[in-house]
């Protein structure tokens, strides 16, 4: 690691639409990429009437957004899809959504990943 | 330096097949998905498959769906596109290009492109 | 399949300008977008992706911003070697699909 930046090999990952992209639905996946880029692994999820439902999860590619983030939080208000990223194998793992809004209190807790029922 | 390098283009009647190659060097190969990418003359760009790193996972754009087929040879550094029942609106250059992880392609080099003219 | 809209389809500029294009999903993509530079008898080179991040080798002049549905490609100050043809693409699913382009000309 450089200055003791965490390096990502390896992310949680998962995939909703797993049929249609022609993927697995759930695994580990290995993070490629040129050596002088940073790796990142990502969650992007919905809540639908406070139900949480993964979209997404996996690795990300040298993202500023993503920089130096041990945890994965999404800090948009509201968005329609929530995305967060981080840096550290497996770091997706737990996701979390945190508003940047003028308040003190954290309005959610972390959330730990279960996937979607399917019939 | 990454390079990529297509060829197998040429004109062929409708109907007929063409098989496109894309020579990959300057980078590994074995760990980036790979894509090919048309551009009919005069017009925009439109997906046409794409490939994993090691072959697990293909998709196809519907147009293509059932007709083309991509394919990988890691130990060669090469990517292939066999295209099959070929149409007039098949025409274009075709690109190869580099993707990053196969959920999130953006494609960061693409070949200088080969020109596939289907007519009779 | 994500039809991505781009507007406008074209516009003319002069050196030192600041363009905006712009790219709209059918649906959200989250930050799954991409910006391509295109020149006459070339292939494609990409210019920003994950909706803000800039590509390698690009000149910081240009910027990306936006996600879910709206996205922007701004190049704050054209320069000669600018005037091209500018996709966005998206990679939140299979197909990916490209906007119509934006030609960028000389005023």
């Known amino acids: 690691a450089i200055l003791g930046r965490s390096e990502t090999q390896e992310c949680l990952f998962f995939n909703a639409n797993w049929e249609k992209d022609r993927t697995n639905q759930t695994g580990v996946e290995p993070c490629y990429g040129d050596k002088d880029k940073r790796r990142h692994c990502f969650a992007t999820w919905k809540n639908i009437s406070g139900s949480i439902e993964i979209v997404k999860q996996g690795c990300w590619l040298d993202d500023i957004n993503c920089y130096d983030r041990t945890d994965c939080v999404e800090k948009k208000d509201s968005p329609e899809v929530y995305f967060c990223c981080c840096e550290g194998n497996m770091c997706n793992e737990k996701f979390s959504y945190f508003p940047e809004m003028e308040v003190t209190q954290p309005t959610s807790n972390p959330v730990t990943p279960k996937p979607p029922y399917y019939n | 330096e990454v390079q990529l390098l297509e060829s197998g283009g040429g004109l062929v009647q409708p109907g007929g097949s063409l098989r496109l190659s894309c020579a990959a060097s300057?980078?590994?190969?074995?760990?980036?998905?790979m894509n090919w990418v048309r551009q009919a003359p005069g017009k925009g760009l439109e997906w046409v498959a794409g490939?994993?790193?090691?072959?697990?996972?293909?998709g196809y754009a519907d147009s293509v769906k059932g007709r083309f087929t991509i394919s990988r040879d890691n130990s060669k550094n090469t990517l292939y596109l066999q295209m099959n029942s070929l149409r007039a609106e098949d025409t274009a250059v075709y690109y190869c290009?580099?993707?990053?992880?196969?959920?999130?392609?953006?494609?960061?080099?693409w070949g200088q492109g080969t020109l596939v003219t289907v007519s009779s | 399949d994500i039809q991505m809209t781009q507007s406008p389809s074209s516009l003319s500029a002069s050196v030192g300008d600041r363009v905006t294009i712009t790219c709209r999903a059918s649906?959200?993509?989250?930050?799954?977008l991409n910006w391509y530079q295109q020149k006459p008898g070339k292939a494609p080179k990409l210019v920003i992706y994950?909706?803000?991040s800039l590509a390698s080798g690009v000149p910081s002049r240009f910027s990306g911003s936006g996600s879910g549905t709206d996205f922007t490609l701004t190049i704050s100050s054209l320069q000669p070697e600018d005037f091209a043809t500018y996709y966005c693409?998206?990679?939140?699913?299979?197909?990916?699909?490209f906007g119509g382009g934006t030609k960028v000309e000389i005023k």
């Open positions: 290009a580099r993707g990053a992880n196969w959920h999130d392609t953006h494609l960061d080099y």
């Open positions: 300057g980078f590994t190969f074995s760990s980036y998905s």
């Open positions: 490939i994993n790193y090691n072959g697990g996972y293909k």
């Open positions: 649906q959200s993509i989250v930050r799954y």
């Open positions: 994950a909706a803000t």
């Open positions: 693409q998206q990679s939140y699913e299979l197909p990916l699909t």
